[in-house]
């Protein structure tokens, strides 16, 4: 058993039929010694008496808010949560496996630049009695500070018969060094509590590996005289690290016909303009990627040829 | 050429070669995201790798103030990786394919280090750790880790030279 926060405790249980469970001793936080009784949640019955209460925790019915009382007064509370371990593996019932980029990916994180700011998100089908708490650091043995905000519900989607809820959190490394080569990964730890179930999820990454620039901005077409060619121009997204001479991007320009089956013409360039042939009913799209490190491409920015 | 006394390197040549290094490093090990190498016990492998750290002056401001600190750190790293790529980690079993980019990568590391420090000038170089894995699978894993680490290192070096070529070239 360990303390998650004040008056909230997590009991770690091996979860299998007829598991012995854990004996837990709760102590009433009071100088009083006599006449103390205990209740569980909204029970009218007294579960035990005395300054300490020994309980056998085997299932979710044993978890909950234990309250000690004396003479009609509440003295203190202890909320017990359960963390299940099945076949040596901690349960992951609360969050959905996003399966990208690999199986057992529950947390996904992205950064728009090298400033040390990043966003993580996760999915669940649970809509109520759900709380998240996020902590992060750079490295784990001698951790350096990363400050995370509160996790918020950022999207709701309908997936077949189920509703899916997306939560996200923004974090900022306290003393970020955008130009340095990272040697210690960022660690992100999410505590998830659903009713009386506790789970924790972790992700470890370098900012460089989760970079995904915003799409290029101000995408424009300039027809060239007496030609089917157009000059496409664009600019670095506002959110990208500066100076651009140091934090450079490379770009992919694509000409795509109306039908998805039509052949796509692609041009790669380090410049912020390119000359392409504009076909009727086609569209021109441009996306960006770090020039020197192959992290994710941005989403496409698009304009119609006409 | 970079002279330890403090003259400027051939920024544009360094830029071109470092960008080529980036391309080669990624073609030598393109499996980004498919194999989480940090799960495989990093300790002895990459702890001794020279990283370009915050205080090494490789940021735009540091380069403007005095690029020598940064160039020395890049040089150290290039020599370190050049030695690693020439060691039995890469020359031993399992043999690299004949068309593997590792050979070109090795030569380009040497080329860039020589651009930074011509014959007869000596910056301190870092001692290469004695990494001699016994099993072929260990060697393979070590190669992946070294290449992943090299990708991060050459990305920073390429940024330094790109910025230098754009803003510090005479």
């Amino acid at each position: 058993i360990w303390e998650l926060k004040k008056d909230v405790y997590v009991v770690e249980l091996d979860w299998y039929p007829d598991a012995p469970g854990e004996m837990v001793v709760l102590t009433c936080d009071t100088p009083e010694e006599d006449g103390i009784t205990w209740t569980l949640d909204q029970s009218s019955e007294v579960l035990g008496s005395g300054k300490t209460l020994t309980i056998q925790v085997k299932e979710f019915g044993d978890a909950g808010q234990y309250t000690c009382h004396k003479g009609g007064e509440v003295l203190s509370h202890s909320l017990l949560l359960l963390h299940k371990k099945e076949d040596g593996i901690w349960s992951t019932d609360i969050l959905k496996d996003q399966k990208e980029p690999k199986n057992k990916t529950f947390l996904r994180c992205e950064a728009k630049n090298y400033s040390g700011r990043f966003t993580c998100w996760w999915l669940t089908t649970i809509s109520t009695d759900l709380t998240f708490s996020v902590k992060s650091s750079r490295g784990s043995s001698d951790p350096q500070g990363v400050t995370c905000g509160a996790a918020t519900l950022s999207a709701e989607r309908v997936r077949g018969d189920n509703k899916e809820y997306e939560y996200s959190v923004e974090c900022q490394e306290d003393s970020a060094c955008p130009a340095a080569e990272e040697s210690l990964p960022i660690e992100v730890m999410v505590d998830a509590v659903h009713k009386l179930k506790y789970e924790n999820y972790t992700s470890s990454f370098f900012i460089r590996d989760i970079i995904k620039p915003d799409p290029p901005k101000n995408l424009q077409l300039k027809p060239l005289k007496n030609s089917r060619q157009v000059e496409v121009s664009w600019e670095y997204p506002d959110t990208w690290s500066t100076p651009h001479s140091y934090f450079s991007l490379t770009f992919c320009v694509q000409v795509q016909g109306k039908s998805k089956r039509e052949k796509k013409d692609r041009v790669f360039t380090d410049k912020t303009s390119a000359t392409v042939i504009c076909r009727k009913n086609a569209s021109i799209s441009v996306r960006a990627q770090d020039r020197y490190y192959s992290s994710s491409w941005s989403e496409w920015a698009s304009v119609p040829c006409s | 050429r970079a002279v330890p006394g403090g003259s400027s390197p051939a920024w544009t040549q360094c830029q071109q070669l470092s960008q080529k290094l980036c391309t080669l490093a990624w073609s030598a090990h393109p499996l980004v995201g498919h194999m989480d190498l940090r799960e495989e016990g990093d300790e002895e492998t990459t702890n001794d790798v020279p990283h370009i750290q915050c205080g090494d002056g490789c940021d735009p401001q540091g380069l403007r103030d005095n690029s020598q600190f940064c160039l020395q750190r890049i040089h150290q790293g290039l020599i370190f990786y050049e030695k690693l790529l020439g060691s039995d980690i890469f020359t031993g079993e399992p043999s690299l394919l004949p068309d593997s980019p590792v050979g070109q990568l090795h030569a380009s590391l040497l080329g860039l280090s020589q651009l930074l420090q011509p014959e007869g000038h000596h910056w301190e170089t870092q001692q290469i750790p004695s990494l001699s894995p016994s099993q072929p699978w260990q060697r393979l894993l070590l190669r992946f880790k070294i290449l992943r680490s090299l990708q991060a290192f050459v990305a920073v070096a390429a940024r330094v030279f790109a910025h230098g070529a754009a803003t510090l070239s005479p």
Epitope: T37, E45, L47, G48, G50, H69 | -
Partner: antibody, heavy 112, light 107 residues
Amino acid sequence: SVEESGGRLVTPGTPLTLTCTVSGFSLNSYSMSWVRQAPGKGLEWIGVIGLGGSAYYASWAKGRFTISGASTTVDLKITSPTTEDTATYFCARATYSDDNIWGPGTLVTVSS
Amino acid sequence: DVVMTQTPSSTSAAVGGTVTIKCQASQSISSWLSWYQQKPGQRPKPLIVRASTLASGVPSRFKGNRSGTEYTLTISGVQREDAAAYYCLGGDGNVSNFGGGTKVVVV
């Protein structure tokens, strides 16, 4: 200690109130249950009054019994006794706790 | 309400033998289960509370166990004075019910 009183012979339909008197502890800190046992039969749980003063009843006992509490007493009112209510009625403190205490019981006989 | 099904309704054991009494709850009641011993003409005496905790002054030959919604009272090394009726009491913390009882005869 816990002691029941008020048991007697009553005719069917005549309301009867049994009293459980406690000493040495505060009713604010304990739940108090009423249990009965018909002659030669098993124990039957009637209801409980909890720490907050709320009463809960077995589904068969709802409407037939009322439990209420005062400072040192807990009452069980049999609203309209029938012959099936003939039993020894026990008052018990904290039936799930290590320090649970039972009274000696009081006999109620319902007969015409 | 939770229904407590107690088995067997009666059993006999030799002195020094073992008696096992089971109570099956109709729903999950976790630790809300007590075992009582009652001798003729006496008030019930608590043996086990919270499914497995020995009540004060009760000999260690009495043991309570729970497995899911099945609760067991085991008397190991039965003594003559253990001849009595035994009842389980289970509930959800608000509404409770007794099992039908088990009469134990010591031969």
